[in-house]
Amino acid sequence: QLSLPSILPNENEKVVQLNSSFSLRCFGESEVSWQYPMSEEESSDVEIRNEENNSGLFVTVLEVSSASAAHTGLYTCYYNHTQTEENELEGRHIYIYVPDPDVAFVPLGMTDYLVIVEDDDSAIIPCRTTDPETPVTLHNSEGVVPASYDSRQGFNGTFTVGPYICEATVKGKKFQTIPFNVYALKATSELDLEMEALKTVYKSGETIVVTCAVFNNEVVDLQWTYPGEVKGKGITMLEEIKVPSIKLVYTLTVPEATVKDSGDYECAARQATREVKEMKKVTISVHEKGFIEIKPTFSQLEAVNLHEVKHFVVEVRAYPPPRISWLKNNLTLIENLTEITTDVEKIQEIRYRSKLKLIRAKEEDSGHYTIVAQNEDAVKSYTFELLTQVPSSILDLVDDHHGSTGGQTVRCTAEGTPLPDIEWMICKDIKKCNNETSWTILANNVSNIITEIHSRDRSTVEGRVTFAKVEETIAVRCLAKNLLGAENRELKLVAPTLRSELTVA
């Protein structure tokens, strides 16, 4: 731990004659620097140099060739490595006065005349005299204001809002400062910070806008951190809203965004008078151009049962916002003519959900359905085939005599989706056909009986069974079945000798 540097002259304060020269020496165990009242531009007559000596200490000398009122103030010698942005300098101080009969008060910058008071806190009105002996009074519109005065700092007290003037008399001559404006600011011990980005997805050339709002607090320092910051990209604004309550709205605008502007946008607010910090972040993505992604929640071949209610849901990710439409067999769906409806809802900023709803599925609802999503940069579509599933039913069951040969063919026509399977059964003992055990399935490999199946169209099938010779009366059953159901019909085949036909339903 280094001991504090020391200053020569070893005094707390020193009065220096106007236009004379003075020098201050600082000794330290490490490299030392000076902080002094004037800014870089004003300090042309301040010279700082390092000096060698035999003590083993580091020595830095501050020299003023011609002292003026502006040189009045606090001179601090400190170790280089101890200086931080945030903290007050730790070091050794000496206060220099340079009395000037024509300049009663130390010259100030314009911003020094704005005195910000936080709620009912005390404040300093910084009118400092160039001479410690000069008597000073403080005035406002109501007259003299009682407040304690320190020539090194100014008037300290609790002040109401408004203008204040410091008055001094030097050798019978009266001096007045320009008005100091005391301005009250509201501050809270906690920071209420809200971030808003109306959009987080952009495309090249668009303007990114992010806002951070601080509520019920006026003593705030807010910093933005974002990808384009190092290149000087981004316009920052502060809007102060006073009604109905205090709100500071900080806006960051990045016009002509590029992909490189993608990333985290962060605002960090700090209570300027207290160590209260709050931070908010949003991730922004900038795309080279717009895009569309379609994600169906069903396959490319879908089935629906007759009279069923069914929804087909498609997720769409898109920017800019897409126009979404549905087609059936490449023609635009006319919803008011069918029991089919479509809708689109926005789920998130760039996420949409579109639904195709079948209210009561009909056979004619079968077909190819296409969802089309498009914006100015992209077009995407997804097509699926829909089949309305219909239970199988027998349309017709007839027989056909082959004349003198004694052969007979039975034809069974059935419909359904999916296409029904046709099975044949036979009952040889006509008297016992009421008993299910009397029926046997007709196998394909039976000699002198031929079975065949022909599909007529997408939903109709015809089955045939040909008996080479029918010698006695038998019953034939046609069984048509698919996933949704089965139907059967029976027919009596009479031997040609009996020349009689009977249909058993």
Partner: antibody
Framework: QVQLVQSGAEVKKPGASVKVSCKAS????????MHWVRQAPGQGLEWMGW????????NYAQKFQGRVTMTRDTSISTAYMELSRLRSDDTAVYYC???????????????WGQGTTVTVSS | DIQMTQSPSSLSASVGDRVTITCRAS??????LAWYQQKPGKVPKLLIY???TLQSGVPSRFSGSGSGTDFTLTISSLQPEDVATYYC?????????FGQGTKVEIK
């Protein structure tokens, strides 16, 4: 057509206040920020601040903080700028000017009032 | 605050000459810069915004360029009606600041 019409010239004593009005016409008043810029005799342009007519929110240059107040009356599409505790160096022409496109980031003061001369003299 | 420094502070050129005015920012301001023209006794007029975009109705002999800290306003062929003071102005952050102006006269 789009125009801003300001109130007439004013002569004030040091310490007094002045309130300058700026009436907008030919466009949606609440859709554009209004700025105030002043120009001392023979000098350049100096920005004072702006008001968002939609929210009433303001931003003042630090130099004028505590002395300037910008307000608006949306019912008559008028913006006001009041400067208090006047000094002789406040003598200038005060302009109101519309910001062409605040939220796009493509700023620029595209429509200006004719200016109001304020003279501060004892 | 961002300081804007214009050069030259005044210039005199002949009709038809190419005239260039420069403006330097004290820190990087990307292309957040506008140029104004103020004729004697008149109100300022916006010529260019976003460093190089011509405001509608402004003659094409005016052009702007630059990005970062160095910017230029060019009048390709000076006309008698171009006699004015030209100001650059940055809107990167508050307070908005103007250059001190460049006075253009005809020889």
């Amino acid at each position: 057509q789009v125009q801003l019409v300001q109130s007439g010239a004013e002569v004030k004593k040091p310490g007094a206040s002045v309130k300058v009005s700026c009436k907008a016409s030919g466009y949606t008043f609440t859709g554009y920020h209004m700025h105030w810029v002043r120009q001392a005799p023979g000098q350049g342009l100096e920005w004072m601040g702006w008001i968002n007519p939609n929210s009433g929110g303001t931003n003042y240059a630090q130099k004028f903080q505590g002395r300037v107040t910008m307000t608006r009356d949306t019912s008559i599409s008028t913006a006001y700028m009041e400067l208090s505790r006047l000094r002789s160096d406040d003598t200038a022409v005060y302009y109101c000017a519309r910001d062409r496109a605040f939220w796009s980031g493509y700023h620029g003061l595209d429509v200006w009032g004719q200016g109001t001369t304020v003279t501060v003299s004892s | 605050d961002i300081q804007m420094t214009q050069s030259p502070s005044s210039l005199s050129a002949s009709v038809g000459d190419r005239v260039t005015i420069t403006c330097r920012a004290s820190q990087v301001i990307a292309n957040y810069l506008a140029w104004y023209q103020q004729k004697p006794g008149k109100v300022p007029k916006l010529l260019i915004y976003a460093a190089s975009t011509l405001q509608s109705g402004v003659p094409s002999r005016f052009s702007g360029s630059g990005s970062g800290t160095d910017f230029t306003l060019t009048i390709s062929s000076l006309q008698p009606e171009d006699v004015a003071t030209y100001y650059c102005h940055t809107y990167k952050s508050a307070p908005w600041t103007f250059g001190q102006g460049t006075k253009v006269e005809i020889k």
